[in-house]
């Protein structure tokens, strides 16, 4: 039975040209995290494997930095980066947990962070 929940940074906004940290946290389970995949729609951004470490997708190498922790830092943001991002936690023995973050990249200098929310 899957008892865990993923807490994410929720809906966030950031300025064009700036950077943002995408962060998820898995709680309420004793399952072992074996791998975390970061995806945008159906595109892979990066993977953090518990043993093999980080793998950054070639097309994002210049703009994605691993961490902090299991999170991901997006740099040199463009308006095209607006959209949904998913953290996919592979765990044993539970299986897969998915968290969703919506990022809006703003032209203006007014970019406020949204509230944290939970996905069961």
């Amino acid at each position: 039975m899957m008892t865990g929940t993923i807490e994410t940074t929720g809906n966030i906004s950031a300025e064009k040209g700036g950077s943002i940290i995408l962060q998820c946290h898995l709680s309420s389970t004793t399952a072992q995290v074996t791998q975390v995949n970061w995806e945008q729609q159906d595109q892979l951004l990066a993977i953090c494997n518990a043993d093999l470490g980080w793998h950054i997708s070639p097309s994002f190498k210049d703009r994605v930095a691993p961490g902090p922790g299991l999170g991901l830092t997006l740099q040199s943001l463009t308006v095209n980066d607006t959209g949904e991002y998913f953290c996919i936690y592979h765990t044993y023995p539970d299986g897969t947990y998915t968290g969703r973050i919506f990022l809006e990249v703003l032209e203006s200098s007014v970019a406020e962070h949204g509230a944290r929310f939970q996905i069961p």
């Epitope: 074996t34 494997n49 470490g53 070639p58 023995p93 299986g95």
Partner: antibody
């Protein structure tokens, strides 16, 4: 096209070590993790472990822990697998295989290297 | 470790037959990723399907996969002469990655 070229067949005595190489071409070596799978004569496939050429991170099957060492040389785009304390049961074809980490499957395989352990 | 039990271990079939091979995981743990390979004597395995049902580029559409949780199936809708080979499933949900024992498809 993408190719994994493995070193030639080896005959070893029990207790010895063997080091098998796998040279890649047709893609950027650091963009995939490289794994090793063996197959004893007439038997099934057995995963041994893998290495991330990006950072040298390794993952080994517990069965081989302490006996296997996987390394890479990014200057020559080559992965290596060394197995020590060889015994007759280690007689097998050893394959290197490129792993797609997103879905954990092997999309490209080497042709295999036969290692025979015999006194 | 999650053991993958493949059945049958061998089967005899004729060209044009529909063939189904199953793979069952030993643990109640969810298998996260499941792939299928074809191997011919003296050759390296060849990828057919990954992520349970995604067909590898260049693989004929007569091959299909399905399943979830602990039970998975490879189906060949109409067996062709070049399909006589041994088939392996492979799972990953944690270390170690494991393969099924194989299913040898022979000519009846």
């Amino acid at each position: 096209q993408v190719q994994l070229v493995q070193s030639g067949a080896e005959v070893k005595k029990p207790g010895a070590s063997v080091k098998v190489s796998c040279k890649v071409s047709g893609y950027t070596f650091t963009e995939y993790t490289m794994h090793w799978v063996r197959q004893a004569p007439g038997k099934g496939l057995e995963w041994m472990g893998g290495i991330n050429p990006n950072n040298g991170g390794t993952i080994y099957a517990q069965k081989f822990q302490g006996r296997v060492t996987m390394t890479e040389d990014t200057s020559t785009d080559t992965a290596y697998m060394e197995l020590s304390s060889l015994r007759s049961e280690d007689t097998a074809v050893y394959y290197c295989a490129r792993l797609v980490l997103r879905y954990w499957y092997f999309d490209v395989w080497g042709r295999g290297t036969l290692v025979t352990v015999s006194s | 470790d999650i053991q993958m039990t493949q059945s049958p271990s061998s089967l005899s079939a004729s060209v044009g037959d529909r063939v189904t091979i199953t793979c069952r995981a030993s643990a109640s743990s969810n298998v996260i990723y499941l792939a299928w390979y074809q191997q011919k004597p003296g050759k390296a395995p060849k990828l057919l399907l990954y992520d349970t049902s995604r067909l590898e580029s260049g693989v004929p559409s007569r091959f299909s996969g399905s399943g979830s949780g602990t039970d998975y199936t490879l189906t060949i809708s109409s067996l062709q002469p070049e399909d006589f080979a041994t088939y392996y499933c492979q799972q990953w949900s944690s270390n170690p990655l494991t393969f099924g024992g194989g299913t040898k498809v022979e000519i009846k």
